[in-house]
Interface confidence: medium
């Protein structure tokens, strides 16, 4: 999916008032330095394709994020503030679940709740400069 | 609703195999991982083993190799489990559970297994 | 593997107590824990997931809490219901281990 059309101020603001609550109740209990941030993102669209990739594609060492409070929420936001996302993920959530194939390993969800919180302060970051 | 309803209780004989069902419903059986937690009399529980059905990959703990079989039948979703060359230390409580992401969030009732001559 | 050691084995409380009980992990597992809770003759119950997330229709009263190698289950209102005996489980790398168990009695 192409993010460029996507209402990026929405976003962040849906972002900053419940997503990154739910992101942080995750991470709770787990120091920030525990994991260190190797995802990154250079601009606001591969920010949230960097973002829905780690959110909704399950990892071999994570499969259950996309189930979680905060997964739902992005998945609500980026269908109400980037036309026909939602369109789009119906083929893509398909494609996923055919090719999908995880194995028994060291659990990775932390870390990658860790990197997910990385990127979207790389978004919002991003989003400053711009304005 | 998600539930695993295990087969009935078991009596064997020293030597002997036993196959254990855990029959899936009210969620896509190929979604998730199915493990195998033994629970000894009185005693705590110990993990078997786990099957992804969706490629019967399988992996299991060290001390249960050669001792334990994990397979699946998608197409009734079931999970089995069979215990080879049982001996009387195999007596127990066998539960299969299922997880995403290693804990487990719904149990079958459990099956006894009692190994006796 | 990591060994998982739970303390008390065993405690004895009155309905309405706080309740504590403590799983230590032999390495770092930083908050991948679960506690479970079984009665006799039923399967275990999920409680609480990464350490601190409560399962789903899980009584407010079980809270878990810490990270690292030192966790704490705890039930701030004993209730009749909740006699029973708690497992802890790391899901950090296979093998799952569990503690031994606590078994939680009427005074």
């Known amino acids: 999916y192409d993010f460029t059309n996507c209402d990026f101020q929405k976003i962040e603001a849906d972002y900053l008032r419940t997503i990154s609550k739910d992101l942080i109740t995750y991470m709770s209990g787990t120091k920030s330095t525990d994991f260190n941030n190797t995802v990154s993102c250079s601009n606001r669209p591969h920010c949230l394709t960097e973002i829905q990739s780690l959110t909704f594609n399950p990892t071999p060492r994570c499969a259950s994020l996309a189930k979680e409070m905060f997964a739902r929420k992005t998945k609500a936001t980026l269908a109400l503030w980037c036309p026909g996302y939602s369109e789009t993920q119906i083929n893509a959530t398909q494609a996923m679940k055919k090719r999908r194939k995880r194995k028994v390993t060291t659990n990775k969800c932390l870390e990658q709740v860790s990197q997910l919180l990385g990127l979207w302060r790389r978004f919002i970051r991003t989003l400053l400069k711009k304005q | 609703q998600v539930q695993l309803v295990q087969s009935g209780a078991e009596v064997k004989k020293p030597g002997a195999s036993v196959k254990v069902s855990c029959k899936a419903s009210?969620?896509?059986?190929?979604?998730?991982?199915m493990h195998w937690v033994k629970q000894a009399p009185g005693q705590g529980l110990e993990w078997i083993g786990v099957?992804?059905?969706?490629?019967?990959?399988?992996t299991y703990n060290q001390k249960f190799k050669g001792k334990a079989t994990l397979t699946v039948d998608t197409s009734t979703s079931t999970a089995y489990m069979e215990l080879s060359s049982l001996r009387s230390e195999d007596t127990a409580v066998y539960y299969c559970?299922?997880?995403?992401?290693?804990?487990?969030?719904?149990w079958g009732q459990g099956t006894l297994v009692t190994v006796s001559s | 593997d990591i060994q998982m050691t739970q303390s008390p084995s065993s405690l004895s409380a009155s309905v309405g107590d706080r309740v504590t009980i403590t799983c230590r992990a032999s390495?770092?597992?930083?908050?991948?824990l679960a506690w479970y809770q079984q009665k006799p003759g039923k399967s275990p119950k999920l409680l609480v997931y990464?350490?601190?997330r409560p399962a789903a229709g899980v009584p407010s009263r079980f809270s878990g809490s810490g990270s690292g190698t030192d966790f704490t289950l705890t039930i701030s209102s004993l209730q009749p219901e909740d006699f029973a005996t708690y497992y802890c489980?790391?899901?950090?790398?296979?093998?799952?281990?569990f503690g031994q168990g606590t078994k939680v009695e009427i005074k």
């Open positions: 099957i992804d059905p969706s490629d019967t990959y399988t």
């Open positions: 559970t299922r997880s995403l992401d290693g804990f487990f969030d719904y």
């Open positions: 390495e770092n597992i930083y908050s991948y």
């Open positions: 009210g969620y896509t059986f190929t979604s998730y991982w």
């Open positions: 990464f350490a601190r």
């Open positions: 489980q790391h899901h950090y790398d296979t093998p799952w281990t």
